[in-house]
Interface confidence: low
Amino acid sequence: TGGQGPMPRVKYHAGDGHRALSFFQQKGLRDFDTLLLSDDGNTLYVGAREAVLALNIQNPGIPRLKNMIPWPASERKKTECAFKKKSNETQCFNFIRVLVSYNATHLYACGTFAFSPACTFIELQDSLLLPILIDKVMDGKGQSPFDPVHKHTAVLVDGMLYSGTMNNFLGSEPILMRTLGSQPVLKTDIFLRWLHADASFVAAIPSTQVVYFFFEETASEFDFFEELYISRVAQVCKNDVGGEKLLQKKWTTFLKAQLLCAQPGQLPFNIIRHAVLLPADSPSVSRIYAVFTSQWQVGGTRSSAVCAFSLTDIERVFKGKYKELNKETSRWTTYRGSEVSPRPGSCSMGPSSDKALTFMKDHFLMDEHVVGTPLLVKSGVEYTRLAVESARGLDGSSHVVMYLGTSTGSLHKAVVPQDSSAYLVEEIQLSPDSEPVRNLQLAPAQGAVFAGFSGGIWRVPRANCSVYESCVDCVLARDPHCAWDPESRLCSLLSGSTKPWKQDMERGNPEWVCTRGPMARSPRRQSPPQLIKEVLTVPNSILELPCPHLSALASYHWSHGRAKISEASATVYNGSLLLLPQDGVGGLYQCVATENGYSYPVVSYWVDSQDQPLALDPELAGVPRERVQVPLTRVGGGASMAAQRSYWPH
């Protein structure tokens, strides 16, 4: 993988027809930022600028608009917003920031509402959205940010909304808040400085007893020559009811700890961008996958990392020692005093004593940090979002698949082999304008990922198996969703009855999996061609034999007969072999790819001359052949012109 990190095996440029994609856009609508999948997986609800949409995603192809309801900021709010020197072209709108399923009949939505956050319930009727009534719109402060550029997060748990956002117009008062439901509204205490003024929330993930918030903020516990950002996980208990005398209507279970995502001996990736939970059979075995960037640009380029954190490790840190602030030195040190009961953050049900609450007010920072496992480190790319799922291979083994959105509008599909670093199956450039991926939503039932952009939503089928045209290519791709079907001779999506199919997720070695026909008789490190393209030489013309580079991970060379053509003697231009008709030029030419220690012909040509036809090698008998045209360049006569020529007699 080198210093750059793993290379995507296949790259699709914007508009490349080889990758099945579809794009939804709606005239007059922008900023498709917030995505919510219905419980049945057939409807995608979308929060855009001043509107909420319901899209039918049941069928492949472009999502179909079921209906759309406008939810604009009021004119008065827009006027106020502009008066406060905000742009009425880019900022003074209602950008939907929270969209959650409240119950079977209602969604709950919040938006920036022209720098005056608002929330509302949206009634559903047969998965259609009913119009929003103005008198049903509520204050959304603490649930949605004021500014559309501010990061935020929200999750609905047991009928209560846990949100992390900016609580003021200036964007200097971060807040973690619980609203809705029967429990009292709770929030972080701004005066206790539990959060630094620039805290930026990226994810909220519920666990058994607690809700975890993931965010980054300026670190206060380190002496550093420049402002140091740090990634954090905070916890609040679901059963927290606030204090009776102290900490009334405030969290009494708030704790935070540092997240560490770093390669040994390297500067950490200290800025968290997004995090998701991949549930397992047992909650404590579940892992959280998070995307990080670094505040330091190594070698002048941005780099990103994905780290995995186990819930067990997070729980352990929150059950460990605290730090406390030495008021005299203004330094944070390990607290070595006696434990109070109930222990802060322990989610015990009973009322806490004044002593315990007083302790909690000052002991909210954990001493240990939560160390993540780096699964993917990639320079030259800035990941913005991720979606994660578990895919079962042909042998029943489970593989973590990550879909990573970038700041330049591409999607990376990465696979994490068990207990190993990730590899990139493909990179798909979605946005032709290199706009960042705003959001990702997996739709497992539809076998697709939906990517939200400023201009619309891309539907990306989770795998593109059909692009792998041979067993070798299919197996080398190591895409857990794809396997080679020997009967149909197609690389296809894994489905129910796949007994004789071929896949090798562990090694990606076609030698074991794809051996059949000639290879079965004599094991060798190179497979025979599947097709031979017959080419006729034309006098006074240079033949150009193209070689499609199917994999960025392969190295390529040309061979003539059984001999490798040395790079020094060959004229290779953009991967194509250039041949000048002369004696001995005929015979079998193969462009051979070597990948993962395995060599295979990408393309095979039989070059013949009209005046001296060659007999085909008997060893290649039975391999299908077709006559093809290749590009020619005429030489001699003072003129040199390249042309696509037909050289077969018509």
């Epitope: 058994t208 007893q209 397992a280 059979d281 047992s282 909650p283 404590s284 075995v285 892992r287 067990t312 729980e315 352990r316 059950k319 009961s341 109930p342 222990r343 322990s346 989610c347 015990s348 049900m349 496992t373 029943g396 083994s397 489970s398 068990q418 207990d419």
Partner: antibody, heavy 116, light 108 residues
Framework: QVQLQESGPGLVKPSETLSLTCTVS??????????WSWIRQPPGKGLEWIGH???????DYNPSLRSRVTISADKPKNQFSLKLNSVTAADTAVYYC????????WGQGTMVTVSS | QSVLTQPPSVSVAPGQTASLTCGAN??????VQWYQQKPGQAPVLVVY???DRPSGIPDRFSGSSSENTATLTISRVEAGDEADYYC???????????FGGGTKVTVL
């Protein structure tokens, strides 16, 4: 569905080494999501944790048995093993292997008697 | 090192509710598991993480905890529920599992 199966001799002489193997099917001992434990139950008594091994190969043992116990994993065979040396009659028990961190599933157990 | 205290036996009539306790200091903040062991069989996990049930375990089994006591409640007790029940948690200091001594449930 993950299944565990213990195997090994049912009778061991005092002062010798008790050796048991747990074969995992339907899952992998290499998986980074689990640890693999040995637990025993003397006749008519409660459960006692012996030790476990993580996918990294790191082991941890019950302090009362640490000096005599070794747990190891054979990833290609998808097995993990228990060795308990210098056994006495007090080591007579049903020995179970189980997947952690919540013990689920368990093997069916194998009775090991220490007797001359 | 946590010590888990379980009553040696509990008797309950069919159709009634059995409450099995597991005592330990500050157990309410810990992740408690409960296992059912029928004679001659291996234990089976019935509740994990305090109150969650693995798939296949009937909803008659439920877990809860207060500050110093974890409770396994078996409602609508059936004859087939007769077994030994063990509580277990991971000691927060040593990170090792600790088992209670077990409670024998007899269905009258």
């Amino acid at each position: 569905q993950v299944q565990l199966q213990e195997s090994g001799p049912g009778l061991v002489k005092p002062s010798e080494t008790l050796s048991l193997t747990c074969t995992v099917s339907g899952g992998s001992v290499s998986s980074g999501r689990y640890d693999w434990s040995w637990i025993r139950q003397p006749p008519g008594k409660g459960l006692e944790w012996i030790g476990h091994i993580y996918y990294t190969g790191i082991t941890d043992y019950n302090p009362s048995l640490r000096s005599r116990v070794t747990i190891s994993a054979d990833k290609p065979k998808n097995q993990f093993s228990l060795k308990l040396n210098s056994v006495t009659a007090a080591d007579t028990a049903v020995y179970y292997c189980a997947r952690g961190p919540f013990f689920d599933p368990w093997g069916q157990g194998t009775m090991v008697t220490v007797s001359s | 090192q946590s010590v888990l205290t379980q009553p040696p036996s509990v008797s309950v009539a069919p159709g009634q509710t059995a409450s099995l306790t597991c005592g330990a200091n500050n157990i309410g903040s810990k992740s408690v598991q409960w296992y059912q062991q029928k004679p001659g069989q291996a234990p089976v996990l019935v509740v994990y993480d305090g109150s969650d049930r693995p798939s296949g375990i009937p909803d008659r089994f439920s877990g809860s905890s207060s500050e110093n006591t974890a409770t396994l409640t078996i409602s609508r007790v059936e004859a087939g529920d007769e077994a030994d029940y063990y509580c277990q948690l991971w000691d927060s200091v040593t990170d090792r599992p600790v088992f209670g001594g077990g409670t024998k449930v007899t269905v009258l």
